[in-house]
């Protein structure tokens, strides 16, 4: 008789999940020689241990502590780029501006980027059929808890001027319910972080509005100011030109507003 299996509302574990995590770990250590001390088999074992045989709505940050310990990494605390709803451009930016880091440029972020995973209570199986959806099922699911944990640690590590890229094409440019709004903003350390600088990325070719005056940006400014951190905001009117100018800052067209 086939065993009854919980049907969740979200997509199931990404196919080849164990192979992908292990391969990504080895690739990361190949790309970053300073992380060659990492034992990728142990990293996978710790990752697996965080959710296998556990109820996928009952995952805690504590479950991920062995993985966090193995993935401990020092990034320059004054070179951190946070982002919200504009991941691709943030990653294109750090690919060019090599001394800056998004969470996905760290080992743990790189391992899990774009993946879904969950297990089942009391069995060692990975659930490839469905996983809990944050809204429809539960928030304490393996994926959400993972990103909450690593995002909190990443924000806590930041210092000096922290940059955040925000999507100016969205109705809520700053969304209190995003990972940035609900986790990272509240875990920046006022004793270490002097300024949060927001880069609002414009979508439309002819969009010349000052999106730094958007009500949600004002809300972000208020939250940040209350935490004794200074706030500044810049409009990036032409993201394509912005990237080009990061690549070639001496280009004559890069002195004007981008």
């Amino acid at each position: 008789v086939p065993r009854w299996r919980q049907q969740w509302s979200g997509p199931g574990t990404t196919k080849r999940f164990p192979e992908t995590v292990l391969a990504r770990c080895v690739k990361y250590t190949e790309i970053h020689p300073e992380m060659r001390h990492v034992d990728c088999q142990s990293v996978w074992d710790a990752f697996k241990g965080a959710f296998i045989s556990k109820h996928p709505c009952n995952i805690t940050e504590e479950d991920y502590q062995p993985l966090m310990k193995l993935g401990t990494q020092t990034v320059p605390c004054n070179k951190i780029l946070l982002w919200s709803r504009i991941k691709d451009l943030a990653h294109q930016f750090t690919q060019v501006q090599r001394d800056m880091f998004t969470l996905e440029d760290t080992l743990l972020g790189y391992l899990a980027d774009d993946l879904t995973w969950c297990g089942e209570f009391n069995t060692s199986k990975i659930n490839y059929q469905s996983c809990p959806d944050w809204r429809k099922d539960c928030s304490n699911n393996p994926v959400s808890v993972f990103w909450k944990t690593v995002s909190r640690r990443f924000a806590e590590a930041a210092c000096d001027v922290v940059h955040v890229m925000l999507n100016g094409s969205r109705s809520k440019i700053f969304d209190k319910n995003s990972t940035f709004g609900s986790v990272e903003v509240h875990n920046l350390q006022p004793e270490k972080v002097q300024t949060l600088e927001a880069w609002v990325i414009h979508g439309g070719r002819e969009d010349s509005r000052d999106l730094c005056q958007d009500p949600t940006i004002k809300e972000l400014e208020s939250i940040i100011s209350k935490r004794n951190i200074q706030f500044s905001c810049k409009n990036i009117y032409r993201p394509d030109k912005f990237l080009q100018c990061v690549k070639n800052p001496e280009d004559s067209s890069c002195t004007s507003e981008i």
């Epitope: 192979e19 391969a23 190949e30 690919q95």
Partner: antibody, heavy 120, light 107 residues
Amino acid sequence: QMQLVQSGAEVKKTGSSVKVSCKASGYTFTDYIMHWVRQAPGQALEWMGWIDPEYGRTDYAQKFQDRVTITADRSMSTAYMELSSLRSEDTAMYYCARSAHTTGFGFAYWGQGTLVTVSS
Amino acid sequence: EIVMTQSPATLSVSPGERATLSCRASEDIYSNLAWYQQKPGQAPRLLIYDANSLADGIPARFSGSGSGTEFTLTISSLQSEDFAVYYCQQYNNYPYTFGQGTKLEIK
């Protein structure tokens, strides 16, 4: 079995560009970093750069930084190395190579090589 | 960048004899070193990785030793197919760099 098959020999004019391809088979293309190495006639091997085919992230040797572009097409399991502003010193055999994950980070697998000849 | 220096440039040895090839790194590379064999018209072939580990399918007559800045490739009893050019390569840091090669020829 694991194979890296490169495109055929090229003869190019000084100042032009060349694009060499490397088709991977027998493994999951996105699981491994792909490197490019070149060897001028009678000379030593020279590392040019790498690509992570999963994300398209690259890194290049300083010497080639301004002239080389490494790309990957995941749907074709193929990596490409384009070298621009060719000069006679770029005449060389160009190889794609990757590690085996079980052999440190030495290059356990190599393409057969693509000879690029630059003439004026 | 790390400079890899191989010596000698050419080594003449008789079949059946032992060959010792040296490689020096300009800075500490720990054990992050590979040795390759290359024959005319062929791609390089990985022999040794992590300074002393034998790659798959490589005969046991090949061995590697050393760590830090001084490394050695030893071929215990030369066979006719071993006469080729040998390169060391460091993968401790980018850019990865190769030695200029040692040509092993029949005496």
